[in-house]
């Protein structure tokens, strides 16, 4: 499995000058160099991965990950079943769907097995980590004359989810975005029938059942308009 | 380099409460991963509460729901609001920050803090 490490955000603090710093008690040695940071996604609530950046180590290491969840019935601790490697060295743990429990606190620990002193433990709330698929099967049917509906599915709990839309004309530079709750519906009220539209859909796991800051992948895009629309007025969703 | 100094400790009944505050001084803490930990007499230091920069807060199980972590990004101070203090409570208090990459990062091990306060001594009595 090849793995995808989303990339730190600027951070340029984030490994310097380790060594200028006082520890409350141990002496500087081999088990207060700071292991990396884990980083987990909920994807869809299917599976979760939980990602390091293993060329950080200062030498190649197969770090080994255990989890838990904080005062619940699944508070013993689990080793990671499944690995995921980058360049034959541990860079993560796939989780499946039955381990994953949203709304428990998430303790993760990573380990250096060489040196068991030199671990790294955080908490996570899982519901915040959450990313869904792209919204699928977008369709566009006309309204009236210059009203034009747009709708997608997406495959989770609809009610979780908002939804950004964005369209733009063959004549614009940019796009235009409009928020959309839990509906999953989008209309344009004034189109102009001489214009080639586009729209495209994202969503998100927030605000009712998490509070998630990562969006989905976008949707394929679906057009509308110029010379294509002739065919059929009143329903068009080809996808590009 | 960091510079933490607590604040706010002190002798309390209990019963009372206490707010600790820790200043730092050298760099933003706007994306550092923050916590509170304590250290009684012949005791391990433990976590009290802990927090992302993204704003996710978790607390010890002896101080949840009477402990309250907050920030303020724009004076550079991390607070712990310490209410219903209990005699075991007692302990040296210390401010802890890691500058982080994911907003998520919130640590519970004390190994995983760069920077480091003095302490402050919070002693309740019966």
């Known amino acids: 499995l090849n793995t995808t490490i989303l990339t730190p955000n600027g951070n340029e603090d984030a490994t310097t000058d380790f060594f200028l710093t006082s520890m409350p008690t141990d002496s500087l040695s081999v088990s207060t160099l700071p292991l990396p940071e884990v980083q987990c996604f909920v994807f869809n609530v299917e599976y979760m991965n939980c990602t390091w950046n293993s060329s950080s180590e200062p030498q190649p290491t197969n770090l080994t990950l255990h989890y838990w969840y904080k005062n619940s019935d699944n508070d013993k601790v689990q080793k990671c079943s499944h690995y995921l490697f980058s360049e034959e060295i541990t860079s993560g743990c796939q989780l499946q769907k039955k381990e994953i429990h949203l709304y428990q606190t998430f303790v993760v620990q990573l380990q250096d097995p060489r040196e068991p002193r030199r671990q790294a433990t955080q908490m996570l709330k899982l519901q915040n980590l959450v990313i869904p698929w792209a919204p699928e099967n977008l369709t566009l049917r006309k309204l009236s004359e210059s009203q034009l509906e747009l709708n997608w599915n997406n495959r989770f709990l609809n009610h979780c989810l908002e939804h950004l839309v964005q369209y733009r004309t063959d004549w614009d530079h940019s796009w235009t975005e409009q928020s959309v709750d839990y509906r999953h519906k989008f209309s344009l009220p004034s189109v102009d029938g001489q214009k080639r539209y586009t729209f495209r859909v994202r969503s998100r796991f927030n605000p009712l059942c998490g509070s998630a800051q990562h969006w989905s992948e976008w949707s394929h895009p679906i057009h509308w308009g110029s010379n294509s629309s002739k065919e059929n007025p009143f329903l068009f969703a080809l996808e590009a | 380099q960091v510079q933490l100094v607590e604040s706010g400790g002190g002798l309390v009944q209990a019963g009372g409460s206490l707010r600790l505050s820790c200043a730092a001084s050298g760099r933003t803490l706007s994306r550092y991963a923050m916590g509170w930990f304590r250290q009684a007499p012949g005791k391990e230091r433990e976590y009290v509460a802990i927090?992302?920069?993204?704003?996710?807060?978790f607390y010890a199980d002896s101080v949840e729901g009477r402990f309250t972590f907050s920030r303020d990004n724009a004076k550079n101070e991390v607070y712990l609001q310490m209410n219903s203090l209990q005699p075991e409570d007692t302990a040296v208090y210390y401010c802890?920050?890691?500058?982080?990459?994911?907003?998520?990062?919130?640590?519970?091990?004390?190994?995983?803090?760069?920077?480091w306060g003095q302490g402050t001594q919070v002693t309740v009595s019966s």
């Open positions: 927090d992302s920069w993204g704003g996710d807060t």
């Open positions: 802890a920050g890691a500058p982080t990459s994911f907003a998520t990062t919130a640590y519970s091990s004390s190994n995983s803090y760069r920077y």
